[in-house]
Interface confidence: low
């Protein structure tokens, strides 16, 4: 529908209260640096200014569109030379470009201050002084640290920080009832964050018919009773919606997503019996449940895949006639027979049978050619299984950890010129798969495993892009979006690295590492431990391990001491020696 | 060319029955989801009935429920809509479209076939 003023047509579909809160969400994920109150000043003015247009649309400026009136807004900012630098270049453009370049210029890794949770009691009364405020501060300052976070998903985010503070600073013992909840709401952002992440990587640099392909693998495992022309509908309008939120039109991308939720729950007993609950709930939690919704059962009569895309004599004529609906036939029929696969297995799969098809349907006798097509298919398909398999033993004989420390001297050795907190992160988190995936049975571990080490690998590759100091990276992350892992797996050692100067200042600590949570002093131990394999990469695995088991006694005996600053002193001093004569440095 | 044409419309009694056919050209039947969809005199557009490109989806509009039947023949790339127990309220234009994406109750039909008329009428 065309709408005289798309400004007034979002606000009264949303109402003041999302509108306002998606607008700041949109102007922290772009300006990143900017103070809070400049963000709520410059909302105010945008909202003062759609209410006019709802009163009256044909009032001036209210036929702009969304991104002129937000770019002329964001580009009224005094300091943004000062501040974001040739960002401000940006300002100088006309949309659809100006847009575009402040896209670019996204930050993924912020230099911001780490957030600091105060006391509970600080906190509760911030809350309660200012509610309104308090859930604006955490919506600026999550939207400014993660500049594509789902902005929809926030919006559920934020009425559960707002129903923790609402219960627990009420409570007897406000710290056990809200830091559990804090942590948990942490964490599932930091997830959400890095799968929306994966989402836009795939919109933005493999194009929207990566996005479709991927979107219509899964949604056939999670709804394998719906037809091919159902799922084909909620592909396309899913990829509108994440076009739009990865894009920046976080107004339309909510409208948007409101609206498929409201067709999916419209239509279940054509999608999927599973949805029933979901669709009984509240707008925001329904969007998040049919997200994250279980997968339907399989149809019990589903014929032979060989059928229609082997036996039959037209798969040539269906193919030349229709490409991709036919390869995405191909794919929804395989992916709702297989929930056991990863979605970037099908997709390997529905490209070797493309590639077949490319190469056999040009051929004298294309149905000899192409008879074999899924023998191909049982190489790609054990690859994985043996790695989980391999990995998820070694993850049960060590414990997450040092699974996680085992991942950070294999990825340091293949990639030892990535920046060492880049390694750290994403080597914890693929350590995570462990704990995450292991627990299931065979059927769920590898659309759980390698579908999660996608979206880690691709916090790897948006990190490195920023500052991109490996070949090898750039090769796997660019090269195909589904073989990344697979790409990333098959590195060896570097054997051009040139080993790093040894540098005693990294291996010095200081007492404030005995007051650091438990989690801050693994990530000291292993922020030590890449330095050492990028000191002496060619160290084996009992070098190491005899090193990090000094290193650990070292910082437990010192803890323990009465004078910690002096021992941590003098006996660094020792450890680094005997380090170094132990890795022969 | 892509096209629809229906046939089997007249006048009928209350309470008779009438079968009302719609053969496709162009396109497989099979492979979309196809609908019946009716305008009474001087009144919108009402979608009666629709069925999906598997048949697995079957789905009727309440007036009709347990009255009307749609069904497809695939060998003869045709759509049928079966009216038993017809009412005068049944009186319409009764015209079978095609939809390009949908698969339960339509929003929008890219093919539409002329309309055969159905009168229901002592």
């Known amino acids: 529908d065309a709408h005289k003023s798309e400004v007034a047509h979002r606000f009264k579909d949303l109402g003041e209260e999302n509108f306002k809160a998606l607008v700041l969400i949109a102007f922290a994920q772009y300006l990143q640096q900017c103070p809070f109150e400049d963000h709520v000043k410059l909302v105010n003015e945008v909202t003062e200014f759609a209410k006019t247009c709802v009163a009256d649309e044909s009032a001036e400026n209210c036929d702009k569109s969304l991104h002129t009136l937000f770019g002329d807004k964001l580009c009224t900012v005094a300091t943004l030379r000062e501040t974001y630098g040739e960002m401000a270049d940006c300002c100088a453009k006309q949309e659809p470009e100006r847009n575009e370049c402040f896209l670019q210029h996204k930050d993924d890794n912020p230099n911001l201050p780490r957030l600091v949770r105060p006391e509970v009691d600080v906190m509760c009364t911030a809350f309660h002084d200012n509610e309104e405020t308090f859930l604006k501060k955490y919506l600026y300052e999550i939207a400014r640290r993660h500049p594509y976070f789902y902005a929809p998903e926030l919006l559920f985010f934020a009425k559960r920080y707002k129903a923790a503070f609402t219960e627990c600073c009420q409570a007897a013992d406000k710290a056990a009832c809200l830091l559990p909840k804090l942590d948990e709401l942490r964490d599932e952002g930091k997830a959400s964050s890095a799968k929306q992440r994966l989402k836009c990587a795939s919109l933005q640099k493999f194009g929207e018919r990566a996005f479709k392909a991927w979107a219509v693998a899964r949604l056939s495992q999670r709804f394998p009773k719906a037809e091919f022309a159902e799922v084909s509908k909620l592909v396309t309008d899913l990829t509108k919606v994440h076009t739009e939120c990865c894009h920046g039109d976080l107004l339309e991308c909510a409208d948007d997503r409101a609206d498929l939720a409201k067709y999916i729950c419209e239509n279940q007993d054509s999608i999927s019996s599973k949805l029933k609950e979901c669709c009984e709930k509240p707008l925001l939690e329904k969007s998040h449940c049919i997200a994250e919704v279980e997968n339907d059962e399989m149809p019990a009569d589903l014929p032979s895949l060989a059928a229609d895309f082997v036996e039959s004599k037209d798969v040539c004529k269906n193919y030349a006639e229709a490409k991709d609906v036919f390869l995405g036939m191909f794919l929804y029929e395989y992916a709702r027979r297989h929930p056991d696969y990863s979605v970037v297995l099908l997709l390997r799969l529905a490209k070797t049978y493309e590639t077949t098809l490319e190469k056999c349907c040009a051929a004298a006798d294309p149905h000899e050619c192409y008879a074999k097509v899924f023998d191909e298919f049982k190489p790609l398909v054990e690859e994985p299984q043996n790695l989980i398999k391999q990995n998820c033993e070694l993850f049960e004989q060590l414990g997450e950890y040092k699974f996680q420390n085992a991942l950070l001297v294999r990825y340091t050795k293949k990639v030892p010129q990535v920046s060492t907190p880049t390694l750290v992160e994403v080597s914890r988190n693929l350590g995570k798969v462990g704990s995450k995936c292991c627990k299931h049975p065979e059927a769920k571990r590898m659309p759980c495993a390698e579908d999660y080490l996608s979206v880690v690998l691709n916090q790897l590759c948006v990190l490195h892009e920023k500052t991109p100091v490996s070949d090898r990276v750039t090769k796997c992350c660019t090269e195909s979006l589904v073989n990344r892992r697979p790409c990333f797996s098959a590195l060896e050692v570097d054997e051009t690295y040139v080993p790093k100067e040894f540098n005693a200042e990294t291996f010095t600590f200081h007492a404030d590492i005995c007051t650091l949570s438990e989690k801050e002093r693994q990530i000291k131990k292993q922020t030590a431990l890449v330095e050492l394999v990028k000191h002496k990469p060619k160290a084996t695995k009992e070098q190491l391990k005899a090193v990090m088991d000094d290193f650990a006694a070292f910082v437990e005996k010192c803890c323990k001491a009465d004078d910690k600053e002096t021992c941590f002193a003098e006996e660094g001093k020792k450890l680094v020696a005997a380090s170094q004569a132990a890795l022969g440095l | 060319e892509v096209q629809l044409l229906e046939s089997g419309g007249g006048l009928v009694k209350p309470g008779g029955s009438l079968r009302l056919s719609c053969a496709a050209s162009?396109?497989?039947?099979?492979?979309?989801?196809m609908n019946w969809v009716r305008q009474a005199p001087g009144k919108g557009l009402e979608w009666v009935s629709s069925i999906s490109s598997s048949g697995r989806y079957i789905y009727y509009a309440d007036s009709v429920k347990g009255r009307f039947t749609i069904s497809r023949d695939n060998a003869k790339n045709s759509l049928y809509l079966q009216m038993n127990s017809l009412r005068a309220e049944d009186t319409a234009v009764y015209y079978c479209?095609?939809?390009?994406?949908?698969?339960?109750?339509?929003?929008?039909?890219?093919?539409w076939g002329q309309g055969t008329m159905v009168t229901v009428s002592s």
């Open positions: 162009g396109f497989t039947v099979s492979s979309y989801t």
């Open positions: 479209a095609r939809d390009p994406r949908m698969v339960g109750n339509p929003h929008e039909f890219d093919i």
